[in-house]
């Protein structure tokens, strides 16, 4: 596990002629924020493909107003690093997309207007634990200067964050088969890193990131015992060969969260929601007040500054948690209607609508029939971003302009002959059949499967299909 860190140094006009106009003006002040998207390997994927390694958003930069007559300078940047945590091994090669977004603080009563100013992309090789790498990328007339690095989260070390380092148990040397951890010579390399949360008692790995179970244990983290005894109330899949599965201790069993924190299971581990005044992985850090500046991501601290007083953080848009430490994934609620693509910009949700739909949440079905006339008495039907005409009898085609051949589909059954008629079609039935489509056989004794024919119409007469 580790963190990819991106530091934006400047965003402004690139060298050479054709300097871009400032994105902000006295009439339309604005501010910038950045989004980074990481993908493993060196593949050149579409910008919309998932950020499999992770993604992050910056805070919003200071509000900027261009001074009349001044050239577009480097624009004021948001505070802090963009951090993309990764759970498993660092891949060594990766693709990145860095987007510069502009928020206009203009006259949009419904909220701010968002627009993508620039997007740069690249493919790089990078070893974890190395120094900051500096980069310059150009997008049109704009230039973005930034640095990046990947660092391992202790106790992981190495260029892929797959080795573990532990303090030495003996003062002089490491255990059998384990080397000293450079540059931490006072620590020893530990066995390779299994999948996060893999049971140390019942699981093992031969490759980084995997979790293979010892006999008698199962589950993705080898925490579920396989029981061959009969189950009174099986809660897992049961079979004659394996018996039934009894859920073993889950990551929240025994509540690892201290100080009244509540535990919730995550796919690979657990997460503590801490009460006010506590934070940390297990809510173990206490005695925090506003004087300690506990709120992340620009959150404002509310509450007493004295040690006995709890605090709360008022979080900026896009963040939540007792310390504003959690980014809100509002796209998980699937707010975009009618198949729209959701984009969480952190400070606002943006829905990219499919053709034929509009609105902040793609909730408006555009009037596909506006200005579209259906000929010959046809009526227009909306749907799916395209208009369709429901045509009157005898007409067809997209706009009901074509005279339809009602007999083209061979509607008369049992060898009946079809005749086009001004109001539809008429079937002349073969001997022994009757009905509008000649679908009913006439019984040998002369009776029919239908009620008596209407007066003046003998079985075998042409039946007009209305």
């Amino acid at each position: 596990a580790g963190v990819f860190e991106l530091q934006i140094h400047s965003f402004g006009p690139g060298p050479g002629p054709g300097a871009p106009r400032s994105p902000c003006s006295a009439r339309l002040p604005c501010r910038l924020f950045f989004r980074v998207c990481l993908k493993p390997g060196l593949s050149e994927e579409a910008a919309e493909s998932p950020c499999a390694l992770g993604a992050a958003l910056s805070a919003r930069g200071p509000v900027y107003t261009e001074q009349p007559g001044a050239p577009a300078p480097d624009l004021p940047l948001p505070d802090g690093l963009l951090q993309v945590p990764f759970r498993d091994a660092w891949p060594g090669t990766f693709s990145f997309i860095i987007e510069t977004w502009r928020e206009e603080l203009g006259d949009q009563i419904g909220g701010p207007a968002w627009s993508l100013l620039a997007r740069v992309a690249g493919r790089r090789r990078l070893a974890a634990g190395g120094p900051w790498a500096r980069d310059i990328q150009r997008a049109g007339a704009w230039e973005l200067r930034f640095s990046y690095r990947a660092r391992c989260e202790p106790p992981a070390v190495g260029t892929a964050c797959t080795r573990l380092c532990r303090p030495r148990s003996a003062p002089s040397r490491c255990g059998p088969g384990l080397r000293p951890c450079a540059p931490l010579e006072d620590e020893c390399e530990a066995p390779l890193v299994c999948r996060a949360g893999c049971s140390p008692e019942h699981g093992f790995c031969e490759q980084p990131g995997e979790c293979r179970c010892l006999e008698g244990w199962t589950g993705p983290l080898c925490t579920v015992p396989v029981s061959t005894s009969s189950c009174l109330s099986p809660r897992g899949p049961s079979s004659a060969t394996t018996g039934c599965l009894v859920p073993g201790p889950g990551p929240c069993d025994g509540n690892p969260c201290a100080n009244g924190g509540s535990c919730s299971e995550t796919p690979r581990s657990f997460e503590c929601t801490c009460p006010r005044g506590f934070y940390g992985l297990r809510c173990e850090v206490s005695g925090v007040t506003c004087a300690d500046g506990p709120c992340f991501n620009g959150g404002l601290c509310v509450g007493g500054a004295d040690p006995d007083s709890a605090y709360i953080c008022h979080c900026p848009p896009g963040f939540q948690g007792s310390n504003c430490e959690k980014r809100v994934d509002r796209c998980s609620l699937q707010p975009c209607r009618n198949g729209g693509l959701c984009l969480d910009l952190g400070h606002a949700l943006r829905c990219r609508c499919r053709a034929g739909f509009a609105g902040p949440r793609c909730e408006h079905d555009l009037d596909d029939c506006a200005g579209r006339a259906c000929a010959n008495g046809g009526t227009c039907v909306e749907g799916g971003g395209a208009h369709r005409c429901s045509c009157a009898l005898g007409f067809g085609g997209r706009d009901c302009r074509e005279r339809a051949d009602p007999c083209a589909a061979r509607p008369c059954a049992h060898g009946g002959r079809c005749y086009a008629h001004f109001s539809g079609l008429v079937c002349a039935c073969a001997p022994g059949y009757m009905g509008a489509r000649c679908e009913f056989p006439v019984h040998p004794d002369g009776a029919s499967a239908l009620p008596a024919a209407p007066p003046g119409l003998r079985p075998g007469d042409p039946q007009r299909y209305l």
Epitope: R60, P62, P78, L105, P112, G293, G299, V302
Partner: antibody, heavy 119, light 112 residues
């Protein structure tokens, strides 16, 4: 351009409640920022009264907390100040101001409105 | 509460000369998580609302002339006007936003 405009009575009697409204144009008060009230007695310095955030959370100056309520009307894009049990010491120019989470700075100020407390 | 104290209360400087205003807080305004000092400087001209000049103790607001600069960390901060202009006559306030918001009492800058 974001604009803030204070409105309300210029004269309030002692012991009554001072009520002011700030009308915001050019930006939705539910999108971002914390929306503050700050006052300045004639010839004196600035005093922060409190704020309401884009999501409706409030925070007040401890010295005024027992008398202050800040609320909002999102349909009109307005936020309001109520200060109860006023005295002559509450005579001041009252400003509505928006603050930026990123910098924790008071970015943009209304022109201010003078409220006099007198019988 | 954090108390902000400015010095001097007033200052008379010749045009083109340097003006220096000091601000001291009763506790540190440095946030070790963000590596920022949450101190801002404001300028208020007669009959106008204040306007932000400097934030994070030393970052100049867009559009503010570069003769204005801020420095300092922790509890002691300084606003410097390197070459005073006639339009700089105003009252200057420091403000902390580390915990709640409090302003200094103000420093009046005049031309000598």
């Amino acid at each position: 351009q974001v604009q803030l405009q204070e409105s309300g009575p210029g004269l309030v009697k002692p012991s009554e409640t001072l009520s002011l409204t700030c009308t915001v144009s050019g930006y939705s008060i539910t999108s971002d920022f914390y929306w503050n009230w700050i006052r300045q007695p004639p010839g004196k310095g600035l005093e922060w009264i409190g704020y309401i955030t884009y999501d409706g959370s409030t925070n007040y100056n401890p010295s005024l907390k027992s008398r202050v309520t800040i609320s909002r009307d999102t349909s009109k894009n307005q936020f309001s100040l109520k200060l109860s049990s006023v005295t002559a010491a509450d005579t001041a120019v009252y400003y509505c101001v928006y603050g930026d989470f990123n910098r924790h700075a008071m970015d943009y100020w209304g022109q201010g409105t003078l409220v006099t407390v007198s019988s | 509460d954090i108390v902000m104290t400015q010095s001097p209360d007033s200052l008379a400087v010749s045009l083109g000369e340097r003006a220096t205003i000091n601000c001291r807080s009763s506790q540190s305004l440095f946030n070790s998580r963000t590596r920022k000092n949450y101190l801002a400087w404001y300028q208020q001209k007669p009959g106008q609302p204040p306007k932000v000049l400097i934030y994070w103790a030393s970052t100049r607001e867009s559009g503010v002339p570069d003769r204005f600069s801020g420095s300092g960390s922790g509890t002691d901060f300084t606003l410097t006007i390197s070459s005073l202009q006639a339009e700089d006559v105003a009252v200057y306030y420091c403000e902390q936003s580390f915990y709640l918001f409090t302003f200094g009492q103000g420093t009046k800058v005049e031309i000598k």
